[in-house]
Amino acid sequence: MAVTACQGLGFVVSLIGIAGIIAATCMDQWSTQDLYNNPVTAVFNYQGLWRSCVRESSGFTECRGYFTLLGLPAMLQAVRALMIVGIVLGAIGLLVSIFALKCIRIGSMEDSAKANMTLTSGIMFIVSGLCAIAGVSVFANMLVTNFWMSTANMYTGMGGMVQTVQTRYTFGAALFVGWVAGGLTLIGGVMMCIACRGLAPEETNYKAVSYHASGHSVAYKPGGFKASTGFGSNTKNKKIYDGGARTEDEVQSYPSKHDYV
């Protein structure tokens, strides 16, 4: 019951996290203009991974997409890549985890298979969360390094005077959404990995066997097979003694008055 709850909760937490990563990636407020001590205008500028927007006090908003890949900073491309990889891994992880859920029965899927799928999805969620956290952190670092004090250096440029005002940009809402979402996905992944341990069947040292009594007296050693979870060292299926004892896998025993099961 606890395993099912842990797995289910891990799935839900990861689902929320991945939804958050998608939302953060699509949001325009990755960097927002610091309006304090801004000598330029009262028009608010905020930028995302895909476009730049200006919003006026009247409520009018205009957004323009970054039209070229060549003119964009390499770091922005890296952030885009990290976020997309995070989303893709998270989406695959969700797909795998749906089939791995203990509360969902698909044909005659064994617990060991579900355990494997739970572990796989858990690892995918962890990597997805780390990608999102890394992407957001790289962008945040870009913001910190670009957080110049507003300067107005007048110089004569091509075609006229250019007043260079390095407007300060600060952390936008998308960064916080991304960090939280990445964290949730990471936590969800860890929960799935924990649930996986509970799903794996325990190793047992017994197996049902049928043996055929031979004419002469035979010493019988049980324990011909050892059940394996698939995670530990897979014990070799060795015959202990061949004096009439057979496991069910080795030979089909025919009904006889001497058969004991």
Partner: nanobody, 120 residues
Framework: EVQLVESGGGLVQAGGSLRLSCVAS????????MAWFRQTPGKQRELVAG???????NYADSAKGRFTISRDNAKKTIYLQMDSLKPEDTAVYYC??????????????WGQGTQVTVSS
């Protein structure tokens, strides 16, 4: 590099009209604000009129009722229609643009100016 090119200046009689235009070119994402400033010898550059992307306008007291600023966002151009010109309107008129050129890049650019002379 962003360039602002003004045109339309010249010599005009008092009471006459002129239409100035300014076109922005180069790598531009957004132009939150475009404005006209003027400067007379020995004086500070002063705002004449400004217009935002959304069309919100702002005029200097001396320009209200006589000057009209308009904007064509698609052409990245602003216009200043100057009517009922007075000799005190004589100045070099500069185009100004607040331009977002890229990620975390927002600069203010100036044109080279166009001379407007109003004779009495």
């Amino acid at each position: 590099e962003v360039q602002l090119v003004e045109s339309g200046g010249g010599l005009v009689q008092a009471g006459g009209s002129l239409r100035l235009s300014c076109v922005a070119s180069g790598t531009i994402l957004n132009i939150p604000l475009m404005a006209w400033f003027r400067q007379t010898p020995g004086k500070q550059r002063e705002l004449v009129a400004g217009i935002t992307t959304g069309g919100t306008t702002n005029y200097a007291d001396s320009a209200k009722g006589r000057f009209t600023i308009s904007r064509d966002n698609a052409k990245k151009t602003i216009y200043l229609q100057m009517d009922s010109l007075k000799p005190e309107d004589t100045a070099v008129y500069y185009c100004n643009a607040d331009v977002v050129t890229g990620l975390m890049r927002r600069n203010v650019y100036w044109g080279q100016g166009t001379q407007v002379t109003v004779s009495s």
